[in-house]
Each structure stands twice: as structure tokens, then as C-alpha cells.
């Protein structure tokens, strides 16, 4: 279940897609990958207030309960639904290899 | 990847399978549901430390832009890598029904 | 496996515009890191690298020849085009269309057969 | 823009000697790990193919024969030993950075 998509806090301030570009030298890549030199990351950031994006029942349950017991029990938190594939070169011990990742870049978030 | 299962943090600190003893009212289905009236309800809670239980390659760019832009990329968090399915048995309009929810429980947490 | 494949009008007139298109298969344009350039080669002579468009639709061109130049792509047909307008005898030459892969710094891993223009009076 | 300057314009080499080309880039193409250049064959009607990718890494499927090797703004191509299918001309190209350019080409005709 999809819930709400109207962010409470604000606009922007609630579960979504940002980019973060970064160096190889940031992700700490800088010796093994050629390319790209520099990489658009995309990651989920940002509040899961109640029902916002639930991903699913333990996402509701969760909401729920961290109401209840917010010490015990935290938010919901806004992690990738689904992921874009990205294509790394990479030095192996033979040579050069292309890799594709599949789990790298988000590419649509929600709460859990 | 299923990195480090060491916490660093101390034991119990760091992402792992809690239980929740919640009702019916707690969750707010105490008008649909009727059995079970107590719901030991588990999910993942605690901290994800640097690559402790990476759920994938997007878990470890995020601890490491993490480490270089804690007030714009947060921590990976502690969210259910599989589940454990529950039955409930729930009123219907025309009566009651066995209903078997398979993103209920957590069954199994990494950091992502 | 790989394929790209160029098509063209063949001839074409001074001041007239040139539509290029390449028709790939084998890989998606929706991947991170994947894209296609242009390039060119008068006969006889060597490669100019004209344009290129990537995944994330983020363009780039040869400066010199920016503002005559239109690369676009149409992700779910697999197809990349290019646009040339008000063109001249130094603009025949055979039409390369080369996959590159790996972000920016990568490398052009295959090419199509090209198709060639003669822009003739 | 980076220019590459390849030397010689053509050469004839003896089959089964060794065939060296160079390539100079204006400006260094290299960080201290990697350099950005390749090289590519291309035979008469036919469309470039890629033999070395990033100065020294062998493209799959080329023979073992065609090695390169430099860093910075030196780079070499080396074919040994020679056979008359390698009659060719051979360009190198960088991806630095954006224009990527290519060299002037080096004819390689076997004698």
C-alpha cells in the first residue's frame, strides 16, 4: 500500500529521491574503478511521518506503535523501493571489466 | 553483501530482530480483527554502524557519504530483510475471514 | 548481444538539415553509465567525435559545432538521433553512431557501420 | 581540447617484425592510478574497432599480439608480431574529458 504522498512536514521535507554527487574518492572506489570518476548517487532521505509512503503493513504497524512508544519503537525509515542498474568500470587482476550493479542508485523510495 | 554481524557499539545496540507486544488497540484493528487479541510484533530496531549488515551496495555508499555529510546523508537504517508470514482472522461484511499477511513480522534485518 | 545501426538521408543539399538515427539493441539507455556519441569521418580522413547523450538525458557537444547540433533519444524505442542544420560540403563524410559505456571517462566498446552524407549542388 | 598527435602518419613494417605507434596528448590524460586513452583499428569500409582500453588493457577477443602501454601524455601501441591482416589505420582517443578527441591516425601497410 502506497499511502499518502502528501508530505505534512513541508514540501521537501519527507521520504523522497535526492541526488548526492560524489568522487571516487568519497565512496572509496579510487583504486579499483576507472569509471565514472564521479557518481550521481541517488538516495531516499527524509521523515516518514504517520501513513506517509508506507510500504507495506509493518511499515502501518510500525507508525502505530512508535505513537505509542517512541522511545522503544523508532519512525518508519525512508530507504529505496526499487533500484536503476548502473554500469561500473572496474580494474580487476586480468585487466578491465565492465559491472553492472544492480543495487547501487535508488530509483524510488518509501517507508518502512 | 551481508557485511560485519559484529556490533561495535556493544551487544544488542546494533540492527537486530526485536519483539513488541502490542493489542489490537495499540495497532488500531480492534474493529476488524479478532484473533489474536496480542500481537508479538517483530521488527528490526537499533543503530547500523559502518557497514555493519550492508544490505547491498547502496547500504555502503550511504555509510560513506554518511561519514562525509552526516547533515545531509543519514545512516543506513535497520529495516526487515525478509518476513515471517501471520494469520488473522478478521470481520468481513458478510462475516469472518482467514487472511494471511506476508509483510507483517519481521523475520530478518540489515541496514540499508 | 550489441547492435547499433545508423540511417540517413544519403544526399543532401547546401543549407539544408541532416536527421540522423541510430537504432541499438542489446543494452538500455535507462542504465547508469550507458550512452551514445556521434562521430564522424570525411572520406579519406580521420574521426571527429560530434556529440553525445547519456543515460540521464544530460547532453554534451562539440564546442565548434554546438549551435548547429541536436542530439536526442527516445529511451524505450532504443533509438538516438542527431540533427545538423544548414549544411555544407565540409559536412560529408560517413555518421558513426558508437555506444559508450561507464559514465564519462569510459570508452566506445561497439560501433555501428555508419551511413554516409553527401551534401552536393 | 586535448590534442593527440600520433607519429608516424604511416609506416610499413615486414611481417613479423614490430609495429610501434605513438600518441601524444596535449595535457596529461592520466590520475596516478589510471589513464584515459584507447586505441582502435580500423580497416578499409569498415567502422573503428576497440584493441586497448585505458593504455593498456586488451579489449576482448583481440589478439595478444597488440599490446600498449605509456601514461600521462606518452602512450604507445605495439604490434608483434605483425601479420597481413593488421593493415589498418590506427587511432588513439581520450576520455579525459569532454571533447573527446582522437588522434591523426597511423596508416599501417605490411610489407
Known amino acids: 500500500a502506497r499511502n499518502g504522498d502528501h508530505c505534512p512536514l513541508g514540501p521537501g521535507r519527507c521520504c523522497r529521491l535526492h541526488t548526492v554527487r560524489a568522487s571516487l574518492e568519497d565512496l572509496g572506489w579510487a583504486d579499483w574503478v576507472l569509471s565514472p570518476r564521479e557518481v550521481q548517487v541517488t538516495m531516499c532521505i527524509g521523515a516518514c511521518p504517520s501513513q506517509f509512503r508506507a510500504a507495506n503493513m509493518h511499515a502501518q504497524i510500525k507508525t502505530s506503535l512508535h505513537r505509542l512508544k517512541p522511545d522503544t519503537v523508532p519512525a518508519p525509515c525512508c530507504v529505496p523501493a526499487s533500484y536503476n542498474p548502473m554500469v561500473l568500470i572496474q580494474k580487476t587482476d586480468t585487466g578491465v571489466s565492465l559491472q553492472t550493479y544492480d543495487d547501487l542508485l535508488a530509483k524510488d523510495c518509501h517507508c518502512i | 553483501a551481508r557485511n560485519g554481524d559484529h556490533c561495535p557499539l556493544g551487544p544488542g545496540r546494533c540492527c537486530r530482530l526485536h519483539t513488541v507486544r502490542a493489542s489490537l488497540e495499540d495497532l488500531g484493528w480492534a474493529d476488524w480483527v479478532l484473533s489474536p487479541r496480542e500481537v508479538q510484533v517483530t521488527m528490526c530496531i537499533g543503530a547500523c554502524p559502518s557497514q555493519f549488515r550492508a544490505a547491498n551496495m547502496h547500504a555502503q555508499i550511504k555509510t560513506s557519504l554518511h561519514r562525509l555529510k552526516p547533515d545531509t546523508v543519514p545512516a543506513p537504517c535497520c529495516v526487515p530483510a525478509s518476513y515471517n508470514p501471520m494469520v488473522l482472522i478478521q470481520k468481513t461484511d458478510t462475516g469472518v475471514s482467514l487472511q494471511t499477511y506476508d509483510d507483517l513480522l519481521a523475520k530478518d534485518c540489515h541496514c540499508i | 548481444q550489441v547492435t547499433l545501426k545508423e540511417s540517413g538521408p544519403g544526399i543532401l543539399q547546401p543549407s539544408q538539415t541532416l536527421s540522423l538515427t541510430c537504432s541499438f539493441s542489446g543494452f538500455s539507455l535507462s542504465t547508469s553509465g550507458m550512452g551514445v556519441s556521434w562521430i564522424r569521418q570525411p572520406s579519406g580522413k580521420g574521426l571527429e567525435w560530434l556529440a553525445h547523450?547519456?543515460?540521464?538525458?544530460?547532453?554534451r557537444y562539440k564546442s565548434s559545432l554546438k549551435s548547429r547540433l541536436t542530439i536526442s533519444k527516445d529511451t524505450s524505442r532504443n533509438q538516438v538521433f542527431l540533427k545538423i542544420t544548414s549544411v555544407d560540403t565540409a559536412d560529408t563524410a560517413t555518421y558513426y553512431c558508437?555506444?559508450?559505456?561507464?559514465?564519462?571517462?569510459?570508452?566506445?566498446?561497439?560501433w555501428g557501420q555508419g551511413t554516409t552524407l553527401t551534401v552536393s549542388s | 581540447d586535448i590534442v593527440l598527435t600520433q607519429s608516424p602518419a604511416s609506416l610499413a613494417v615486414s611481417l613479423g617484425q614490430r609495429a610501434t605507434i605513438s600518441c601524444r596528448a596535449s595535457q596529461s590524460v592520466s590520475t596516478s592510478r589510471f589513464s584515459y586513452m584507447h586505441w582502435f583499428q580500423q580497416k578499409p569500409g569498415q567502422a573503428p574497432k576497440l584493441l586497448i582500453k585505458y593504455a593498456s588493457n586488451l579489449e576482448s577477443g583481440v589478439p595478444a599480439r597488440f599490446s600498449g602501454s605509456g601514461s600521462g601524455t606518452d602512450f604507445t601501441l605495439n604490434i608483434h608480431p605483425v601479420e597481413g591482416e593488421d593493415t589498418a589505420t590506427y587511432y588513439c582517443q581520450h576520455s579525459w574529458e569532454i571533447p573527446y578527441t582522437f588522434g591523426g591516425g597511423t596508416k599501417l601497410e605490411i610489407k
Open positions: 547523450n547519456d543515460w540521464d538525458d544530460d547532453k
Open positions: 558508437a555506444r559508450r559505456v561507464g559514465g564519462l571517462e569510459g570508452y566506445f566498446d561497439y
